[in-house]
C-alpha cells in the first residue's frame, strides 16, 4: 500500500480468482483514543471500533472511502483505491491501446519544434468518475524538470456503438536548448483513476523523435506564362524552430487529381518553392519534415489548381 | 526517398556537401546495423545513449547559432581549447568562433574515426562475420576531415591484446552509430547555417 496523495491510498493486488488479497491497517487521524467507529462509503454499518481498523482487501467491494467517527462526528477519511496486477503485468483497463506506432501505445506525444514544449494525448471509452494527473521529467535517475498542465478533455468521437474520449496535456521542459543533443529521454507518467481503480501509464521519448512540424504556411500558386506549369511557393510554419538555416525543413509537393485513384505526382525539395504541372480540378499540397532527422511529416497544406 | 528531388545549388561552402554525405552514410549504416543485429538491443529505446566526445569537445556549444546564444539553457559551455586554422570558409571570413566550431567538428570526426576503425578490426575477427562497417561511411568521414583541413595530432588506433567479446562489440557499435548519427545531424545543421550566413 502507498499514498497517492493526502488521505488517498493505493493497494496493489495480485489479481486472480480466490486470491488472498492484502491485509491493510487503517489508522484514524485523531488524538482521540476511545469511542471510535469505522464505516465504508455511505453505509452506516459499523465495520469495527478502535483507533485502527484491520481489513483484508481482495476485491473492489473492499475499496472505497473508510471513515472514522466519534459520537456522530467525522474524524478522518482514508480512500482506498485498487491497482490490479494480472499475471505480473499491471492492468490497463482505463485507456485504449492506440496501436500506433506499435501495440501497447496508450500515450502518444508530439512536438511542433525543438523548444522543449510537447503535447501528449490518450483515449478512453469511460465518460464519468475519471481523473488524470500528469508528471514528467527529463531522465529518471537524476530527473530534470518538466512542467505539465492539467489534462483536459480535447475531443469526443463516436466509434461504432461506443463514444471515445480524447484527453490531452501540454508540457514544457523547464530549461530546454533547441540545439541540444538529447541523451536522456523525456519520461511522461499519467496516473488514471476510474471510480476505485488506479492505473498508471508511462511514455519515454526524445523530443527529436516526436517532432511533427505544423504544415507550411502561405501556400501560393503563380502561373508561368505560356505554360501549364505553376510556381508553388510557401513559408516555414510560424511554430517551427529558428533560425531556419539551422533548423532546416525539407518539403514534399504533391499534385493530386480529384479522384483518389489518379496518379499522384510528387517532388521533394529543400527550397520553399517548386515548379509543377497543374492539372484541371487537381489540388497542390505541400508538407514539411525536419531536413536532417526523419521524424514525422507535417499534415498537408493544400490549394486548388484553379 | 526514391522520388525526384529538386537539389539545391552547391553553395560557396565546400563542407556542406560532405556533411550531407556523412549523414546519409551514417543513417544507412545504422539502418543496416538495426536490421542485421535484430536479436541484439540496437534500437534507440534499448541502448544507452553515450557520447564519446563528452568533456573532450563541445561542438553544440561552439557551433551554436548566434540567435540561440541569448538562450541561457544553451550556454552550459565547457572550456575546451582548439586549433583554429580551418579552411572550409574563405580565410577572411573565418572568425575565431567559427574556427573553434569547425575544429570541434574535426575533433569529433577524428575520435569517431578511431573508434570505428578499432571496432571494425574486432568485427573482422568475428567467426560469424555478421556485420562490418561500411567502407563508404569511413571514406566520407575522411573526406569531411580533409575538407575541414585542420592540423592535429594523429590519434593512434587502439589495439587490444585480449580476445574480443563480439556480443559487446556489436552492442557498442549500435551505441556508437546512434551517437554518431545525432552528431552528424548537428554537423549538418551547422554547415547549413554557416552556408546561409
Amino acid at each position: 500500500i502507498w499514498e497517492l496523495k493526502k488521505d488517498v491510498y493505493v493497494v496493489e493486488l495480485d489479481w486472480y480468482p480466490d486470491a488472498p488479497g492484502e491485509m491493510v491497517v487503517l489508522t484514524c487521524d485523531t488524538p482521540e483514543e476511545d469511542g471510535i467507529t469505522w464505516t465504508l462509503d455511505q453505509s452506516s454499518e459499523v465495520l469495527g471500533s478502535g483507533k485502527t481498523l484491520t481489513i483484508q482487501v481482495k476485491e473492489f467491494g473492499d475499496a472505497g472511502q473508510y471513515t472514522c467517527h466519534k459520537g456522530g462526528e467525522v474524524l478522518s477519511h482514508s480512500l482506498l483505491l485498487l491497482h490490479k496486477k494480472e499475471d505480473g503485468i499491471w492492468s490497463t483497463d482505463i485507456l485504449k491501446d492506440q496501436k500506433e506506432p506499435k501495440n501497447k501505445t496508450f500515450l502518444r506525444c508530439e512536438a511542433k519544434n525543438y523548444s522543449g514544449r510537447f503535447t501528449c494525448w490518450w483515449l478512453t471509452t469511460i465518460s464519468t468518475d475519471l481523473t488524470f494527473s500528469v508528471k514528467s521529467s527529463r531522465g529518471s535517475s537524476d530527473p530534470q524538470g518538466v512542467t505539465c498542465g492539467a489534462a483536459t478533455l480535447s475531443a469526443e468521437r463516436v466509434r461504432g456503438d461506443n463514444k471515445e474520449y480524447e484527453y490531452s496535456v501540454e508540457c514544457q521542459e523547464d530549461s530546454a536548448c533547441p540545439a541540444a543533443e538529447e541523451s536522456l529521454p523525456i519520461e511522461v507518467m499519467v496516473d488514471a483513476v476510474h471510480k476505485l481503480k488506479y492505473e498508471n501509464y508511462t511514455s519515454s521519448f526524445f523530443i527529436r523523435d516526436i517532432i511533427k512540424p505544423d504544415p507550411p504556411k502561405n501556400l501560393q500558386l503563380k502561373p508561368l506564362k505560356n505554360s501549364r506549369q505553376v510556381e508553388v511557393s510557401w513559408e516555414y510554419p510560424d511554430t517551427w524552430s529558428t533560425p531556419h538555416s539551422y533548423f532546416s525543413l525539407t518539403f514534399c509537393v504533391q499534385v493530386q487529381g480529384k479522384s483518389k485513384r489518379e496518379k499522384k505526382d510528387r517532388v521533394f525539395t529543400d527550397k520553399t518553392s517548386a515548379t509543377v504541372i497543374c492539372r484541371k480540378n487537381a489540388s497542390i499540397s505541400v508538407r514539411a519534415q525536419d531536413r536532417y532527422y526523419s521524424s514525422s511529416w507535417s499534415e498537408w497544406a493544400s490549394v486548388p489548381c484553379s | 526517398r526514391n522520388l525526384p528531388v529538386a537539389t539545391p545549388d552547391p553553395g560557396m561552402f565546400p563542407c556542406l556537401h560532405h556533411s550531407q554525405n556523412l549523414l546519409r552514410a551514417v543513417s544507412n549504416m545504422l539502418q543496416k546495423a538495426r536490421q542485421t543485429l535484430e536479436f541484439y538491443p540496437c534500437t534507440s529505446e534499448e541502448i544507452d545513449h553515450e557520447d564519446i566526445t563528452k568533456d573532450k569537445t563541445s561542438t553544440v556549444e561552439a557551433c551554436l547559432p548566434l540567435e540561440l546564444t541569448k538562450n541561457e539553457s544553451c550556454l552550459n559551455s565547457r572550456e575546451t581549447s582548439f586549433i583554429t586554422n580551418g579552411s572550409c570558409l574563405a580565410s577572411r571570413k573565418t572568425s575565431f568562433m567559427m574556427a573553434l566550431c569547425l575544429s570541434s567538428i574535426y575533433e569529433d570526426l577524428k575520435m569517431y574515426q578511431v573508434e570505428f576503425k578499432t571496432m571494425n578490426a574486432k568485427l573482422l575477427m568475428d567467426p560469424k562475420r555478421q556485420i562490418f562497417l561500411d567502407q563508404n561511411m569511413l571514406a566520407v568521414i575522411d573526406e569531411l576531415m580533409q575538407a575541414l583541413n585542420f592540423n592535429s595530432e594523429t590519434v593512434p588506433q587502439k589495439s587490444s591484446l585480449e580476445e574480443p567479446d563480439f556480443y559487446k562489440t556489436k552492442i557498442k557499435l549500435c551505441i556508437l552509430l546512434h551517437a554518431f548519427r545525432i552528431r552528424a545531424v548537428t554537423i549538418d545543421r551547422v554547415m547549413s547555417y554557416l552556408n546561409a550566413s
Partner: antibody, heavy 115, light 111 residues
Framework: QVQLVQSGGGVVQPGRSLRLSCAAS????????MHWVRQAPGKGLEWVAF????????YYADSVKGRFTISRDNSKNTLYLQMKSLRAEDTAVYYC????????WGQGTMVTVSS | SYVLTQPPSVSGTPGQRVTISCSGG????????VKWYQQLPGTAPKLLIY???QRPSGVPDRFSGSKSGTSASLAITGVQAEDEADYYC????????????FGTGTKVTVL
C-alpha cells in the same frame, strides 16, 4: 472453490459451426479476464482467444481470427467460444482458463472436425 | 508459431536432478514473467511455477524455476516416477499481451 465446467464439444463437419461454453462458479466471474486454449492430439498448447473482465476487449490468435468469437455473459457467469467455418486443423481439446498469476482450468472439451 | 523453445524430451533416473530450458527473446521472456505447467496424460495443465520462481501452495518443493535474460528453466531435484509428464513454459510478448505464448513442450521420462 473455483470451478470451470465446460460443454459443447463434439464431432462437426468442415465448414460448420459449434459453440463451446464454460460455466464459472466459486468466484466473482465479472472481475476477471478469461482465455480459451486448445491442444491438438499429440501436440502442444496453443492460445486461442482472450476476453476482458467486462467484455470490452477481445484478442484472437491469427489462426482463428475472423472465424471464432469469444464472448461472455457476466449475468450467467458463462464464457463462450463461437466457432464458424471449422477446419480439420481446429480438431483439438479446448480449455477455458482464468487470467492471472494463479490460474484455474476447465476440464477440457474435445472438438473433432471431420467429414 | 512457437516463439518459446524447449527441448522435446529429457530423462533421468529417480532421485536425479532434471532441468528443462525455455528459450525466448527480448520482447517476451526478456521483459515478462514465466510460468511452468505440468500436464499428465488426458488432464488439463497444472500450474507449477508462476512469476519465474514462485511455487503455488501444494506444489512440492522439488520443483523450482529461474529466469536469466531471455531464457528460463525448470529444475526437478530428486525426480520421481509421478513427475513423468509433459511440461510447458508460458510467457507473454510485450506487443501481443494478453495473448499467451506457450513453449513447444518437453516430455520428461523417468527411467
Amino acid at each position: 472453490q473455483v470451478q470451470l465446467v465446460q460443454s459443447g464439444g463434439g464431432v462437426v463437419q468442415p465448414g460448420r459451426s459449434l459453440r463451446l461454453s464454460c460455466a464459472a462458479s466459486g468466484f466473482t466471474f465479472s472481475s476477471y479476464g478469461m482465455h480459451w486454449v486448445r491442444q491438438a492430439p499429440g501436440k502442444g498448447l496453443e492460445w486461442v482467444a482472450f476476453i476482458r473482465y467486462d467484455g470490452s476487449n477481445k484478442y484472437y490468435a491469427d489462426s482463428v481470427k475472423g472465424r471464432f468469437t469469444i464472448s461472455r455473459d457476466n449475468s450467467k457467469n458463462t464464457l463462450y467460444l463461437q466457432m464458424k467455418s471449422l477446419r480439420a486443423e481446429d480438431t483439438a481439446v479446448y480449455y477455458c482458463k482464468t487470467h492471472g498469476s494463479h490460474d484455474n482450468w476447465g476440464q477440457g472439451t474435445m472438438v473433432t472436425v471431420s467429414s | 508459431s512457437y516463439v518459446l523453445t524447449q527441448p522435446p524430451s529429457v530423462s533421468g533416473t529417480p532421485g536425479q536432478r532434471v532441468t528443462i530450458s525455455c528459450s525466448g527473446g527480448r520482447s517476451n521472456i526478456g521483459c515478462n514473467t514465466v510460468k511452468w505447467y505440468q500436464q499428465l496424460p488426458g488432464t488439463a495443465p497444472k500450474l507449477l511455477i508462476y512469476g519465474n520462481d514462485q511455487r503455488p501452495s501444494g506444489v512440492p518443493d522439488r520443483f523450482s524455476g529461474s529466469k536469466s535474460g531471455t531464457s528460463a528453466s525448470l529444475a526437478i531435484t530428486g525426480v520421481q516416477a509421478e513427475d513423468e509428464a509433459d511440461y510447458y513454459c508460458q510467457s507473454y510478448d510485450r506487443g501481443t499481451h494478453p495473448a499467451l505464448l506457450f513453449g513447444t513442450g518437453t516430455k520428461v521420462t523417468v527411467l
